[in-house]
Interface confidence: medium
C-alpha cells in the first residue's frame, strides 16, 4: 500500500459482499497535531494517508482535554457536560460514587449518558465492533457493541490490527459495518518523556508501523479503497515542569476542608461528601483565589462564568470551582504533589499543544485535501453520514463537515422561523408617557417632535438601512411565542423583545474609518421614550435608580453616529439594556476603541449584539419562567451575558455589505458580572485588559445561536453547509505551541 501512488477512485471499489463501505474509527491517544508536521518523515504510512486523503490542520478537542471525556465525545457528538464523562476522575453526589480509570465503577452504566456510535449503528440494523474505546465495555442503555474487547493495554498493536482484519473477513451476515480501534500511544510516551522526546518519536514510529499493517491488510483484501477510515486523536500533549506549579497552600492557611482534582484542569469541591457537597462555599474559594499574585498562573472561575465555548458547567459532576490553568503549569494542593515534569494534557482546548489530529481516507472522502480545523463534536454526525444512518440528537451541527465528502449524504437547510415579527409602527411623534426619561436638549415639544420624526423612516430609507446594516438578513427567532418587532433607524436596525422590554439584537455596520481615534463620548444627559413602543413594553429610565450596581447601557452605541443630531436615534428607551457599572466600562471601551480597530483592519465590520439569558447555565436560552425566577422585584430582567458577533468579508477588498464570497466571523459571549475581577484590572488602564478579556470569551456563532434562539446569515447567498462551517468556526489567536 505504501509504495503505490494515491488511488483516485471516483466510486467505491468494494469487493463482492461489501455492498456499502465499512467505517473504521481509529484513535491514537495524545497524537498532537504538530507531530504530524514535525515528524512526517518518520511516519510514512500516516503521512501517505494525509497526502492521499483528507486531513484538517487540526481537530479541536473538547474541554477538559482528557482521554475519557474526548473519546466519548467523539462517539456521541455530545459535550462532556451532556454525556456525563466530564473527566477521567469525578464524583457524582446523586450516585454518591467516584469514577476513576483504575476502578470497576467506570463500567457502571449510570455514568455514561448519550448514545454512542456503536448503539446508533446497531439500533438501525448494523453491526458494530470495538477494539477498545472508552464506554465500549459498558452496558450503555442495557447494550454492548455487537463485538467488543475488554480493555487490556498490554495487547500488542499488531495483534489488535490483525483481529480487526479478521472481523473484516467475517461472513457478510456477521460482519460489522462500524469498527473502532484504540492505541495508547503516543500518549503514554508523551506523559513519560514530554511531547518533544525520543520516547515520543519512537512511539510515533511504532504506531505508524501498526497503521501501515492495517492499510496493507486492507490492500490485500482489496478494501483499501472500500473502507472509509478516520484516524484521529482525543487531545494533544504539553510539557510540564516541576518549577511551574501553583500550590493551594500558598493561597489558603488550611486546605483540609476541600478536595482538589489536581493538574491542568483542576476542580475543587467539599472534602466531606456527600454531607457538605451543596453547602460548600464555592464563591468564597473563588474569591480567595482571585487576583492574589501579580504573576498568578491560573484563573479561578465558578463554572457558570467559564467561557461559554467550553460548554463545561451544566452537570452535577462538574464541581463549581474551576481553575483555568496557564499552558505548561499545574495547580495542586501542596508541595507533597511531585507528579510533574514529563507531559500532560487537560488544558484550555484553544492551546495549540492540545490540538489533535484528524485524517480520513476512503471512497466517501475527498482526496488530497486539507480542510480548516473543526471540533470533535462534529465527527459523530459525519460517521452517521458515512454509514447512511440517522444520528441521535447531539451537540454537533449536522452538515458542517459536508465539505469533507465527495457526495454529501445529508443536505442541511436553514431553520424555519418560529416566532414571526411585526414592525413597531410610528403613530405619534409625541410620547404618551415620558417613562421618567430626561433630555434637557429637547426643551419643547417642537424639538421633541423633530427628533422623533427621524424615527419615522420611508420605505426607501428602510430598504437602504437594511442593505447596509443587515447585509446577511435579519436574525430569525427560533424561540416559541416571542412577541418582537423590528425597529428601523438610519444607522442601525434592532429586534425589540416586548416581554423583556429590551432589544433582543441590534445590527449595524461600522465602516472602515480613515480616522482610528476613539469615538466621541455619548451625549451624556439625554434619553427619551421611544414613541414606537407602547409604555407597557418599555423600560423606564427610573428603573436604574433603584440599584446602585446596575446602570443603563446602549446596545447600539450612540457615539457611532458621528454627529450629535443622529445620536438622538440611539438615545431612546428601546436601545437600553441593563448593565453592571463595571461591565459597562469594558463594553464602552470595546465599542469606542476595539470595534474601530477591527473595522479598520477588516474594511468594515457588521456588528450584531444583544443580551443573553442563561441563568441555568446549560448553554441554551432560558424559558420565560426561568428568567422570571430571577427578576428580583424588577420589571427588567438582567442578562447573564452579552453577545457581539463581528462579521466581515474574508476578501478584505470588499466591505461586509458587498461581500461576494466567504465571510469572516469573530463572535464574543461576555459574562455579565458585577465586577471585572476576572481580569484583575486594579490600577490598570482598559487598554491592558479589555481586549484580553474579550478574547478569552470568543465563541462560535453557533454558541450564540443556541444561547439566544436566533438564527443568523439566512439571507447570505451561499450553500447552507458552507454557512454551517462559518457558524461552527472558532477564531483562535494562539500562536505558540
Amino acid at each position: 500500500w505504501l509504495e503505490e501512488n494515491c488511488d483516485t477512485a471516483q466510486q467505491s471499489q468494494c469487493p463482492e459482499g461489501f455492498d456499502l463501505p465499512p467505517v473504521i474509527l481509529f484513535s491514537m491517544d495524545g497524537f498532537r497535531a504538530e507531530y504530524l508536521y514535525t515528524w512526517d518523515t518518520l511516519m510514512p504510512n500516516i503521512n501517505k494517508l494525509k497526502t492521499c486523503g483528507i486531513h484538517s490542520k487540526y481537530m479541536r478537542a473538547m474541554y477538559p482535554t482528557k482521554t475519557f471525556p474526548n473519546h466519548y465525545t467523539i462517539v456521541t457528538g455530545l459535550y462532556p457536560e451532556s454525556h456525563g464523562i466530564i473527566d477521567n476522575n469525578m464524583y457524582d453526589v446523586n450516585l454518591n460514587k467516584n469514577f476513576s480509570l483504575s476502578s470497576k465503577e467506570q463500567n457502571n452504566p449510570a455514568w455514561w449518558h448519550g448514545q454512542p456510535m456503536w448503539l446508533t449503528a446497531m439500533y438501525q440494523g448494523l453491526k458494530a465492533a470495538t477494539y477498545f474505546w472508552p464506554g465500549s465495555e459498558v452496558a450503555i442503555n442495557g447494550s454492548f457493541p455487537s463485538i467488543y474487547m475488554p480493555y487490556n493495554g498490554s495487547v500488542p498493536f499488531e495483534e489488535r490490527i490483525s483481529t480487526l482484519l479478521k472481523w473484516l473477513d467475517l461472513p457478510k451476515a456477521e460482519r460489522p459495518r462500524f469498527y473502532t480501534m484504540y492505541f495508547e500511544e503516543p500518549d503514554s510516551s508523551g506523559h513519560a518523556g514530554g511531547p518533544v522526546s525520543a520516547r515520543v518519536i519512537k512511539a510515533l514510529q511504532v504506531v505508524d508501523h501498526a497503521f501501515g499493517m492495517l492499510m496493507e491488510g486492507l490492500k490485500q483484501r482489496n478494501l483499501h479503497n472500500c473502507v472509509n477510515i478516520i484516524l484521529l486523536a482525543d487531545h494533544g500533549m504539553d510539557q510540564t515542569y516541576c518549577n511551574k506549579m501553583e500550590y493551594m497552600t500558598d493561597y489558603f492557611p488550611r486546605i483540609n476542608f476541600f478536595y482538589m482534582y489536581e493538574g491542568p484542569a483542576p476542580r475543587i469541591r467539599a472534602h466531606n461528601i456527600p454531607h457538605d457537597f451543596f453547602s460548600f462555599n464555592s464563591e468564597e474559594i473563588v474569591r480567595n483565589l482571585s487576583c492574589r499574585k501579580p504573576d498568578q498562573h491560573f484563573k479561578p472561575y465558578l463554572t457558570p462564568d467559564l467561557p461559554k465555548r467550553l460548554h463545561y458547567a451544566k452537570n452535577v459532576r462538574i464541581d463549581k470551582v474551576h481553575l483555568f490553568v496557564d499552558q505548561q503549569w499545574l495547580a495542586v494542593r501542596s508541595k507533597s504533589n511531585t507528579n510533574c515534569g514529563g507531559g500532560n494534557h487537560g488544558y484550555n482546548n484553544e492551546f495549540r499543544s492540545m490540538e489533535a489530529i484528524f485524517l480520513a481516507h476512503g471512497p466517501s472522502f475527498k482526496e488530497k485535501t486539507e480542510v480548516e480545523p473543526f471540533e470533535n463534536i462534529e465527527v459523530y454526525n459525519l460517521m452517521c453520514d458515512l454509514l447512511r444512518i440517522q444520528p441521535a440528537p447531539n451537540n454537533g451541527t449536522h452538515g458542517s463537515l459536508n465539505h469533507l465528502l465527495k457526495v454529501p449524504f445529508y443536505e442541511p437547510s436553514h431553520a424555519e422561523e418560529v416566532s414571526k415579527f411585526s414592525v413597531c409602527g410610528f403613530a405619534n411623534p409625541l410620547p404618551t408617557e415620558s417613562l421618567d426619561c430626561f433630555c434637557p436638549h429637547l426643551q419643547n415639544s417642537t424639538q421633541l417632535e423633530q427628533v422623533n420624526q427621524m424615527l419615522n423612516l420611508t420605505q426607501e430609507e428602510i430598504t437602504a438601512t437594511v442593505k447596509v446594516n443587515l447585509p446577511f438578513g435579519r436574525p430569525r427567532v427560533l424561540q416559541k411565542n416571542v412577541d418582537h418587532c423590528l425597529l428601523y433607524h438610519r444607522e442601525y436596525v434592532s429586534g425589540f423583545g416586548k416581554a423583556m422590554r429590551m432589544p433582543m439584537w441590534s445590527s449595524y455596520t461600522v465602516p472602515q474609518l480613515g480616522d482610528t481615534s476613539p469615538l466621541p463620548p455619548t451625549v451624556p444627559d439625554c434619553l427619551r421614550a421611544d414613541v414606537r413602543v407602547p409604555p407597557s413594553e418599555s423600560q423606564k429610565c427610573s428603573f436604574y435608580l433603584a440599584d446602585k450596581n446596575i446602570t443603563h447601557g446602549f446596545l447600539y452605541p450612540p457615539a457611532s453616529n458621528r454627529t450629535s443630531d443622529s445620536q438622538y436615534d440611539a438615545l431612546i428607551t428601546s436601545n437600553l439594556v441593563p448593565m453592571y457599572e463595571e461591565f459597562r466600562k469594558m463594553w464602552d471601551y470595546f465599542h469606542s476603541v476595539l470595534l474601530i480597530k477591527h473595522a479598520t483592519e477588516r474594511n468594515g465590520v457588521n456588528v450584531v449584539s444583544g443580551p443573553i439569558f442563561d441563568y441555568n447555565y446549560d448553554g441554551h436560552f432560558d424559558a420565560p419562567d426561568e428568567i422570571t425566577k430571577h427578576l428580583a422585584n424588577t420589571d427588567v430582567p438582567i442578562p447573564t451575558h452579552y453577545f457581539v458577533v463581528l462579521t466581515s468579508c474574508k476578501n478584505k477588498s470588499h466591505t461586509p455589505e458587498n461581500c461576494p464570497g466567504w465571510l469572516d466571523v469573530l463572535p464574543f459571549i461576555i459574562p455579565h458580572r458585577p465586577t471585572n475581577v476576572e481580569s484583575c484590572p486594579e490600577g490598570k488602564p482598559e487598554a491592558l485588559w479589555v481586549e484580553e478579556r474579550f478574547t478569552a470569551h470568543i465563541a462560535r456563532v453557533r454558541d450564540v445561536e443556541l444561547l439566544t434562539g436566533l438564527d443568523f446569515y439566512q439571507d447570505k447567498v451561499q450553500p447552507v453547509s458552507e454557512i454551517l462551517q462559518l457558524k461552527t468556526y472558532l477564531p483562535t489567536f494562539e500562536t505558540t505551541i
Epitope: 421618567d436 430626561f438 433630555c439 429610565c541 427610573s542
Partner: antibody, heavy 123, light 107 residues
Amino acid sequence: QVQLQESGPGLVKPSQTLSLTCTVSGGSISSGGYYWSWIRQHPGKGLEWIGIIYYSGSTYYNPSLKSRVTISVDTSKNQFSLKLNSVTAADTAVFYCARVAIVTTIPGGMDVWGQGTTVTVSS
Amino acid sequence: EIVLTQSPDFQSVTPKEKVTITCRASQSIGISLHWYQQKPDQSPKLLIKYASQSFSGVPSRFSGSGSGTDFTLTINSLEAEDAATYYCHQSRSFPWTFGQGTKVEIK
C-alpha cells in the same frame, strides 16, 4: 472623598465681571457621571440655581441669567468656573458650587457642596 | 419654568414630634425631586434624592415619598439638631428650581 472649594474675590464693583472657581479634590472631574453646578443664595433668601456643566463642556444655564453667565471647565486642573458679567448690587449673594450625580441621564440631588463664598457687589 | 411650592413656610415643633413638609410642582416631574437641609451659615446638605431614596449617612428618621406633582418630606421623631430650613429641588427640566424653603424651629 470628593470635596469642593470655591475661590474668588469677595468684593466686585458694579458693572464688572464676577469670577469664581471651584476646585475639586478627591476625585476626577472628567470621570463622567456627574454634572457640576453653581447655586447662589441672596442674603436671608432661598436657593437659586445658576447653571451646570458636564466635563465634556456642555452647559445649561438659568434663562434669567443666561445672557450674563458663562460656566467653563478645566479638566487638567480639576476645576470649573463661573463668570457673571455686568453685576449689580442685586447679585450680592453666597455662591455655592455643587456636584450632581447622574443616573440613567436623570440628574440626582446635589450630593456634595462647597462651603460657599460670599460675594458683595459694591463700589 | 416649573414652580415648586412648599408648605408650610414655617413650623414650630416639639422634639420627638413628627414633621411633614409638602412640596407641590406646577407640572409633573416624575421622581426628579430632592430634599435638602440647610442650617444657618452652612451649605445645604442632601437628605433625599429621587423623591424617596435616602442619601447615605442621613438618619433613618428622614424619609421622602411622592411622584408626579406631590411630594412629602417626613421627619419621624424630631430631634433638636433638626432645626433648619428644608428645601425641595427639581431636576426634571431646565431651569432647575428650588422651593421657597420651610423653616423648622424647635419649641
